[in-house]
Interface confidence: low
């Protein structure tokens, strides 16, 4: 389910109809409300890392930044979750990870993000214009998805470069612009809530947005500003994507699976030395999908010896458009 | 009742390829990956790969890289296996299983098909 | 790849007898084994997965133990239906099934 992200521009209303929308006083306000509390929705980032040591060596990492508990992450290549990707490894916060050739060491970095050393030789080997993949699923927030690759010129030991692309995907140039919105609309909130109720309408009103977009995402400037923007979806040299892409609907996973059905609602658990979430200063950040869980609260899995709770009869939530391979 | 139904035995030629199908009944379908195994005469099971019914996505053991190829069908809630360039080595019981996302094993099994290769 | 090592191979026991069927993975598995019964002509049925724990409707004669590296099985006062080869899986790391035995009543 991919939702592009709408632009909300804000126009000046046709002269005249000021005293005749004197309602915008209090519309305005909650729509910008609105707009201020969606700006916490959660984004993923992507670095792809050619190794200078070892040409045919990538490094993956991903992160997930956002509130909510990660209960899967699926690293797929070639294309995201049923176009194309076929998934390279799956981490589990509780039951651990998966991998398949190329991938070499998989890992979690720090509590919400993962990296992912990559070799290969032949048919399966990766290359430099290979896309990328990292979903998560999270709870409550749904799955999250974002792509990146290495930029054709990209050096050995380089990953991409700090500069943002010249061209942007219609969907990054929206998620920018939305980010502008919701940073001039949460100002002009606290401006509205400091001004007397009997004050002049303002005035500046939202159009309407797309029914497209339930709702905007933001996309954080300072990530925008050091993120290397690339077209997701690039076509794949085919001599650098694995034998088995040429199933009918190939990908990863989880599935696997580019995603996998999971019911996990929990913190992860892991090495008690995870740090913060750390920024990334270059990548290759792509566009984010969203699947929202069917429902809320499921089982975690084992948590420990001698304790298994069993699904729920209608089995785990996919992640929708999701493993993976979960 | 959870059920996977699987196809009739199929007897092939080395060098053709056949495509054998589970048909699953009892929960949802989309909620639950569904692995392939194969049981070679006289020897244990090899896990071969998973589909993610709900958009298609795949893994292969590496071994059957080439080899399987898995699909679905949504709408008839039924997954595929299309095993090519058969040779004798292929002659086995091939068993769909669901698997459980979580815990990782499989829970619920298919009847299994018998792939005969043979001249 | 961890590799299984189930033994034996096959065993004969009498009704209501126990028996014991032991897996030996090539590095620790962390408890992540299930145990299935297979019968001719059907698929195989999960009896107990994360080394103990029964499924639902699986009778409690049958039990199982182990950690690390090493785990066992165990059915106890036999009964015929329990004439079937038994497999252990792994899926700490991928999957991987033991050899099997195969369980005939004297």
């Known amino acids: 389910m991919r939702t592009e992200a709408q632009v909300p521009a804000l126009q000046p209303p046709e002269p005249g109809l000021e005293g005749a929308m004197g309602h915008r006083t209090l519309v305005l306000p909650w729509v910008l409300l609105t707009l201020c509390v969606t700006a916490g929705t959660p984004e993923v980032w992507v670095q792809v890392r050619m190794e200078a040591t070892e040409l045919s060596s990538f490094t993956i990492r991903c992160g997930f930044l956002g509130s909510g508990s990660i209960s899967l992450v699926t690293v797929s290549w070639g294309g995201p979750n049923g176009a194309g990707g076929t998934t390279l490894a799956v981490l589990h916060p509780e039951r651990g990870i998966r991998q398949w050739a190329p991938a070499r060491q998989a890992r979690w970095e720090t509590q919400s993000s993962i990296s992912l050393i990559l070799e290969g030789s032949g048919a399966s080997s990766p290359c430099a214009n290979t896309t990328f993949c990292c979903k998560f699923a999270s709870f409550p927030e749904g799955s999250w998805e974002a792509c990146g690759s290495l930029p054709p010129s990209s050096d050995p030991g380089l990953s991409a470069p700090p500069t943002p692309a010249p061209i942007l995907r219609a969907d990054l140039a929206g998620i920018l612009g939305v980010s502008g919105v919701l940073l001039f609309g949460c100002v002009y909130l606290l401006h509205l809530l400091r001004r007397h109720k009997h004050r002049p309408a303002p005035r500046l009103q939202p159009s309407r947005t797309s029914p497209q977009a339930p709702r905007a995402r933001a996309w954080a400037p300072s990530q925008a500003s050091q993120a290397a923007l690339h077209v997701p979806y690039a076509t794949i040299n085919t001599s650098c994507r694995p034998a088995t892409l040429d199933t009918a609907h190939p990908h990863g996973g989880p599935s696997w699976w580019a995603s996998l059905p999971t019911h996990a609602a929990h913190r992860p658990q892991g090495p008690a030395a995870w740090a913060s979430t750390p920024i990334p200063a270059r990548g290759s950040f792509v566009s984010v999908e969203n699947g929202l869980y069917a429902q809320a609260g499921e089982r975690p899995p084992h948590t420990g010896p001698g304790l298994t709770l069993f699904p729920d009869p209608r089995g785990p939530r996919a992640m929708e458009g999701p493993l993976g391979v979960r | 009742e959870v059920q996977l139904q699987q196809s009739g035995p199929e007897l092939v030629k080395p060098g053709s390829s056949v495509k054998i199908s589970c048909e699953a009944s009892?929960?949802?379908?989309?909620?639950?990956?569904v692995d392939w195994v194969k049981q070679s005469h006289g020897k244990s099971l090899e896990w071969i790969g998973a589909i993610n019914p709900n958009d298609g996505g795949t893994s292969y053991n590496q071994k059957f890289e080439g080899k399987a190829t898995l699909t679905v069908d949504k709408s008839s809630t039924t997954a595929y296996m299309e095993l090519r360039s058969l040779t004798s080595e292929d002659s086995a019981v091939y068993y769909c299983?669901?698997?459980?996302?979580?815990?990782?094993?499989?829970?619920?099994w298919g009847t299994g098909t018998t792939v005969t290769v043979s001249s | 790849d961890i590799q299984m090592t189930q033994s034996p191979s096959s065993l004969s026991a009498s009704l209501g007898g126990k028996v014991t069927i032991t897996c030996k993975a090539s590095q620790d598995i962390n408890k992540y084994i299930a145990w299935y019964q297979h019968k001719p002509g059907k698929g195989p049925r999960l009896l107990i997965h994360y080394t103990s724990t029964l499924q639902p409707g699986i009778p409690s004669r049958f039990s199982g133990s182990g950690s690390g590296r090493d785990y066992s099985f165990s059915i106890s006062n036999l009964e015929p239906e329990d004439i079937a080869t038994y497999y252990c899986?792994?899926?700490?790391?991928?999957?991987?099934f033991g050899g099997g035995t195969k369980l005939e009543i004297k």
């Open positions: 899986l792994q899926y700490d790391n991928l999957w991987t």
């Open positions: 009892g929960y949802t379908f989309a909620d639950y990956n």
């Open positions: 299983a669901r698997w459980v996302i979580n815990d990782w094993y499989f829970d619920v």
